[in-house]
């Protein structure tokens, strides 16, 4: 039975040209996390594997950085970066947990961070 929940940074906004940290956290389970995938819609951005460390997709190498922790830092943001981002936790024995973050990249300087929320 899957008992865990994923807490994320929720709906967030950031300025064009700036950077943002996407963060998820899996709680309420004793399952071992073996890998975390970060995806934007259907594109794989990065993988953090418990044994092998980080792999950043070549097409994002210049704009994506690992961390802090299991989070992901997006740099040099453009309006095209607006959209849904997913953290996919592969765990044993529970299986897969997915968290969703919506990022809006704004032209102006009125970017605000949303509150955290939980996805069961």
């Amino acid at each position: 039975m899957m008992t865990g929940t994923i807490e994320t940074t929720g709906n967030i906004s950031a300025e064009k040209g700036g950077s943002i940290i996407l963060q998820c956290h899996l709680s309420s389970t004793t399952a071992q996390v073996t890998q975390v995938n970060w995806e934007q819609q259907d594109q794989l951005l990065a993988i953090c594997n418990a044994d092998l460390g980080w792999h950043i997709s070549p097409s994002f190498k210049d704009r994506v950085a690992p961390g802090p922790g299991l989070g992901l830092t997006l740099q040099s943001l453009t309006v095209n970066d607006t959209g849904e981002y997913f953290c996919i936790y592969h765990t044993y024995p529970d299986g897969t947990y997915t968290g969703r973050i919506f990022l809006e990249v704004l032209e102006s300087s009125v970017a605000e961070h949303g509150a955290r929320f939980q996805i069961p």
Epitope: Q23, H25, V33, L52, W54, I56, P66, G69, L70, T73
Partner: antibody, heavy 117, light 106 residues
Framework: QAYLQQSGAELVRSGASVKMSCKAS????????LHWVKQTPGQGLKWIGY????????NYNQKFKGKATLTADTSSSTAYMQINSLTSEDSAVYFC??????????WGQGTSVTVSS | QIVLTQSPAIMSASPGEKVTMTCSAT?????MHWYQQKSGTSPKRWIY???KLASGVPGRFSGSGSGTSYSLTISSMEAEDAATYYC?????????FGAGTKLELK
């Protein structure tokens, strides 16, 4: 088995700068963040920042921005930290540590820096 | 930045005794890491992600907590457990460490 070998102790003059190294072996250097941590007897552990050798990205603790500079040479799997404008406050042991998402799992043996006036 | 307060600063325990030390954060954090350091050596990852034991750590150690309150517990103290234990958070930049709890053998 991952291993981090740090450079030897340094005795440096106040106002000068120092550059220490951290040579990584036993793992893929470009797949892990490399952190630097300062330890002083009275102040405990202070996180300085990290570098991701895969693309050179750095993330600094604001308190050390301008004081420390982190670099990495992927050809030799070596990370470096330079500390400038040294004062007695910079006398400490500096550790490098590997981190791949699940806390800092391997640490170097530390480099002792003593600043003399 | 988030400040982590560890208590007690120093404690002593007899072999076989249960030991609990705490780490309190000024703001809520999603998880906590713990490191063990013995005099003259580098810190070692001990407990990560609040409750997961690092490789080689004896099963008598456990970690728990949520929000602003976390703890490390040793079910039965052994001589080799005498060391300083540091908590660390990275829910918020910059990462911060507690000042440490020094555990001595009575």
């Amino acid at each position: 088995q991952a291993y981090l070998q740090q450079s030897g102790a340094e005795l440096v003059r106040s106002g000068a700068s120092v550059k220490m190294s951290c040579k990584a072996s036993g793992y893929t250097f470009t797949s892990y963040n490399l952190h630097w941590v300062k330890q002083t007897p009275g102040q405990g552990l202070k996180w300085i920042g990290y570098i991701y050798p895969g693309n050179g990205y750095t993330n600094y603790n604001q308190k050390f921005k301008g004081k420390a500079t982190l670099t990495a040479d992927t050809s030799s799997s070596t990370a470096y930290m330079q500390i400038n404008s040294l004062t007695s406050e910079d006398s400490a042991v500096y550790f490098c540590a590997r981190e791949g998402g699940w806390a800092m799992d391997y640490w170097g043996q530390g480099t002792s820096v003593t600043v003399s006036s | 930045q988030i400040v982590l307060t560890q208590s007690p600063a120093i404690m002593s325990a007899s072999p076989g005794e249960k030991v609990t030390m705490t780490c309190s954060a000024t703001s809520s954090v999603s998880s906590m890491h713990w490191y063990q350091q013995k005099s003259g050596t580098s810190p070692k990852r001990w407990i990560y992600d609040t409750s997961k034991l690092a490789s080689g750590v004896p099963g008598r150690f456990s970690g728990s907590g949520s929000g602003t309150s976390y703890s490390l517990t040793i079910s039965s103290m052994e001589a080799e457990d005498a060391a300083t234990y540091y908590c660390q958070q990275w829910s918020s930049n910059p990462s911060t460490f507690g000042a440490g709890t020094k555990l001595e053998l009575k």
